[in-house]
Interface confidence: medium
């Protein structure tokens, strides 16, 4: 069965800091969305092997990728308090499959000690209702998916 493993469950970062979210998927896959949950869930990125990634304007210049679509690490830089929230990986397949979510807490330096992450994933109630297919971009057929891009993560 299609499955999305997402890590970490929770991460704390200072204002201006960075976080990594990893989405690992088994089975056939068109691409990966990272969505920020909330009253109006918002797509942050869409990543597909070999295809130029798409990034929401609010995160322009603040996102890096490493790996490939089935084992993708998304790095968000220059974090702001408004970036606090739960982010979930959405695997775009014949049906949409979701990761368990990552709670990102962006804190001011002085309040860092007040926050703790538990080992439990964010509550399932925070997960969005899967969007309708019409809300997704047109996707190529699996046979048309090209090879992995030449992307190197610098130290």
């Amino acid at each position: 069965a299609q499955e999305v493993q997402q890590s970490p469950h929770c991460t704390i970062a200072p204002v201006g800091g960075s976080v990594n979210i990893t989405c690992s998927t088994s089975g056939e896959l068109h691409g990966i969305y990272l969505r920020q949950l909330g009253p109006q869930p918002q797509n942050i990125i869409y990543y597909e092997d070999r295809v130029v990634p798409t990034t929401d304007k609010r995160f322009q210049g603040r996102i890096d990728f490493s790996g490939s679509q089935d084992n993708l690490t998304i790095t968000m830089h220059h974090l702001q308090p408004s970036d606090t929230g739960t982010y979930t990986c959405q695997a775009v397949t014949e049906i949409n499959v979701y990761g368990s979510g990552t709670l990102v807490l962006v804190t001011e330096e002085q309040s860092q000690g007040l926050h703790r992450c538990s080992d439990a994933p964010p509550t399932g109630s925070a997960l969005p209702v899967p969007p309708t297919t019409s809300a997704l971009p047109a996707l190529p057929t699996a046979s048309a998916l090209p090879a992995l891009p030449t992307a190197s993560a610098l130290p």
Epitope: V52, T54, G61, D64, H77, T150, L154
Partner: antibody, heavy 125, light 107 residues
Framework: EVQLVESGGGLVQPGGSLRLSCAAS????????MSWVRQAPGKGLEWVSS????????FYADPVKGRFTISRDNSKKTLYLQMNSLRAEDTAVYYC??????????????????WGQGTLVTVSS | EIVLTQSPATLSLSPGERVILSCRVS??????LAWYQQKPGQAPRLLIY???NRATGIPARFSGSGSGTDFTLTISSLEPEDFAVYYC?????????FGGGTKVEIK
């Protein structure tokens, strides 16, 4: 006004090295992906390499992979292209270009706007 | 890689004429296609992005259309400053690729 000024071009022998620089001004350099595009004399445009805003992710065209290295220094608002093992076919005007800025769901590396004036690299013995 | 084929290679026209330039793509790029103008001795300039959106400061006589694999750039009425080379470019897939260009020259 956005300005991109390339430098570092010149005549170099095959197998030699050059480092191109692109000094940026008029925008928040650290928020934009940047690219190098080249144009051989009398020929069309060829994308060479791109780098993400943070500098952590880089992309290369196959003909330059393993020979060219793109990098950036956000504190100096400068983009670089280190070119090693140069070949005659690398002779071209090299342009640096900034990501276009527009306020819809936009590409991580998108359209080139604006471009610098270019710097000529000639590889010849 | 995605190959972009522009036609014709050269167009000889007079000011005031309507121009239609073609860019055919080897596989679908959705709407991720742009057009650039380059004059002799100058850097290229972005005209149209995402198939049909005019870049900042570009006159309304320039328009783009198409989708998938067939795209056109139309200049409704040629001005003297429009004689130049025009390139299309896709950003759907790596590597980013350009067409070979169409030169619009004065008849």
């Amino acid at each position: 006004e956005v300005q991109l000024v390339e430098s570092g071009g010149g005549l170099v022998q095959p197998g030699g090295s050059l480092r191109l620089s692109c000094a940026a001004s008029g925008f928040t350099f650290s928020r934009y992906a940047m690219s190098w595009v080249r144009q051989a004399p009398g020929k069309g445009l060829e994308w060479v390499s791109s780098i993400s805003a943070s500098g952590a992710t880089t992309f290369y065209a196959d003909p330059v992979k393993g020979r060219f290295t793109i990098s950036r220094d956000n504190s100096k608002k400068t983009l670089y292209l280190q070119m090693n093992s140069l070949r005659a076919e690398d002779t071209a005007v090299y342009y640096c270009a900034k990501d276009q800025d527009f306020d819809i769901l936009t590409g991580y590396l998108n359209w080139f706007d604006p471009w610098g004036q270019g710097t000529l690299v000639t590889v010849s013995s | 890689e995605i190959v972009l084929t522009q036609s014709p290679a050269t167009l000889s026209l007079s000011p005031g004429e309507r121009v239609i330039l073609s860019c055919r793509v080897s596989q679908s790029v959705s709407s991720y296609l742009a057009w650039y103008q380059q004059k002799p001795g100058q850097a290229p300039r972005l005209l149209i992005y995402d198939t049909s959106n005019r870049a900042t400061g570009i006159p309304a006589r320039f328009s783009g259309s198409g989708s998938g694999t067939d795209f056109t750039l139309t200049i409704s009425s040629l001005e003297p400053e429009d004689f130049a080379v025009y390139y299309c470019q896709q950003r759907r897939n790596w590597p980013l690729t350009f067409g070979g260009g169409t030169k619009v020259e004065i008849k």
